[in-house]
C-alpha cells in the first residue's frame, strides 16, 4: 500500500472458504504476508499465508471449517486485513469489511458425466460443489463445447437461467471428439462472479450408421 497500485479482492464460496488475492505494484516478493479474518458476530478468527502467484500478486484461502459447513450468512460482515511482516512487527497493508453473500464465487461444478450419447446429440449432467442451501434454486449456469479445430475462447456460451444440472447438446457431428465445460453463478450478490470452469469432460459422438447421413 506504500507505492503503486494495490488491490485486495476476496470471494466467498458460500460455505467455508474465502479466497483472497492481493496485488501490489513494487512490493517485495519475499515479504511474509497473511490475510486475517475477523467476523463481526462469530467467535472464530482465521488466518492464511499469502503465497505468490505472479510477480506482484499473492493469494490464499481462508478455510473456515469443513467443506460443506455453513460458516457465514448474509448478515455477517468479516473484516479482512492483509498483514505483512516488517522486521519484528506486522504492518497492515490493506483492509476491507467483507460481506460474504455480496462477493460470491462458487466452486467449479464437479462429477461431469455423459448420460447418453448419439450421433448428433449428447446429454451431460454435473453436480454443484459446496454450494449453500440458502440459494435454493437461485443459480444459473453457463456451458461451452469445444469443437475440433477451435479454442475454448471461440466456443459459443450456452446459458441456463435456472438450476438445471444437465444439458442436451444438439446438432453435433457424428464420430467426433468434443470437450464440454460448465460454470455456475448465484443470482445473489452485487460483486458475485462466475465460478471457475469445470474440468473439461471429453466425449465422442457415435458414428453415423452405414448408408445413412
Amino acid at each position: 500500500a506504500v507505492n503503486g497500485t494495490s488491490r485486495f479482492t476476496c470471494f466467498y464460496n458460500s460455505r467455508a472458504n474465502i479466497s483472497c488475492v492481493w496485488s501490489q505494484d513494487g512490493a517485495l516478493q519475499d515479504t511474509s504476508c497473511q490475510v486475517h479474518a475477523w467476523p463481526d458476530r462469530r467467535r472464530w478468527n482465521q488466518t492464511c499465508e499469502l503465497l505468490p502467484v505472479s510477480q506482484a500478486s499473492w493469494a490464499c484461502n481462508l478455510i473456515l471449517g469443513t467443506p460443506d459447513s455453513q460458516k457465514l450468512t448474509a448478515v455477517d460482515i468479516v473484516t479482512l486485513r492483509v498483514m505483512c511482516r516488517e522486521g519484528v512487527r506486522w504492518r497492515m497493508m490493506a483492509i476491507q469489511d467483507f460481506k460474504p453473500f455480496e462477493n460470491l464465487r462458487l466452486m467449479a461444478p464437479i462429477s461431469l458425466q455423459v448420460v447418453h450419447v448419439e450421433t448428433h446429440r449428447c446429454n451431460i449432467s454435473w453436480k454443484i460443489s459446496q454450494a449453500s442451501h440458502y440459494f435454493e434454486r437461485h443459480l444459473e449456469f453457463e456451458a461451452r463445447t469445444l469443437s475440433p479445430g477451435h479454442t475454448w475462447e471461440e466456443a459459443p456460451l450456452m446459458t441456463l437461467k435456472q438450476k438445471q444440472e444437465w444439458i442436451c447438446l444438439e446438432t453435433l457431428t457424428p464420430d467426433t471428439q468434443y470437450e464440454f465445460q460448465v460454470r455456475v453463478k448465484p443470482l445473489q450478490g452485487e460483486f458475485t462472479t462466475w465460478s471457475p470452469w469445470s474440468q473439461p469432460l471429453a466425449f465422442r459422438t457415435k458414428p453415423a450408421a452405414l448408408g445413412k447421413d
Partner: nanobody, 126 residues
Framework: QLQLVESGGGLVQTGTSLRLSCAAS????????MGWFRQFPGKEREFVAA????????VYVDSVKGRFTISRDNAKSTVYLQMNSLKPEDTAVYYC???????????????????WGQGTQVTVSS
C-alpha cells in the same frame, strides 16, 4: 516519512466545544484513512473516530456519536475533530493517526495505523 502534529487541546468546561487539528507533513500522498484515538491515564489507547481518504466514509465510537465530528481537508493535509457537548469523561490525551493501507473498515484497531502524532491533552472540568 510522514509526520503528524496535533493542536487545539486544552482545558475547557463541561458542555463546551473544542476543535482538534492534525497537520500531516512529508509523504502525505501516501495517506489513506486518518483517525483519532484517545488514551485515559493508565489505560490502552481507544479508537474515537476515522475518516476515509476522500472523506466519504466516517466511523465513530458509540460514546462520542452525535457529539464529535471528524473531517479532513486534503489540500491542507489536515484532519479535524470537532468535539461538542464535552463531558469530564472525555478527558484524555488525543492522538492523531494515519494509515497508508488501502481500503476501509468500520472496525479500526490501534495496530491498523502506522503513523501517530505525539498527542494533545484535552481536559474537561466540571
Amino acid at each position: 516519512q510522514l509526520q503528524l502534529v496535533e493542536s487545539g487541546g486544552g482545558l475547557v468546561q463541561t458542555g463546551t466545544s473544542l476543535r482538534l487539528s492534525c497537520a500531516a507533513s512529508g509523504h502525505t500522498s501516501r495517506i489513506n484513512a486518518m483517525g483519532w484515538f484517545r488514551q485515559f491515564p493508565g489505560k490502552e489507547r481507544e479508537f474515537v473516530a476515522a475518516i476515509s481518504r476522500n472523506g466519504g466514509s466516517t466511523v465513530y465510537v458509540d460514546s462520542v456519536k452525535g457529539r464529535f465530528t471528524i473531517s479532513r481537508d486534503n489540500a491542507k493535509s489536515t484532519v479535524y475533530l470537532q468535539m461538542n457537548s464535552l463531558k469530564p469523561e472525555d478527558t484524555a490525551v488525543y492522538y492523531c493517526t494515519a494509515t497508508d493501507a488501502v481500503g476501509w473498515t468500520t472496525r479500526w484497531m490501534t495496530a491498523d495505523f502506522g503513523f501517530w502524532g505525539q498527542g494533545t491533552q484535552v481536559t474537561v472540568s466540571s
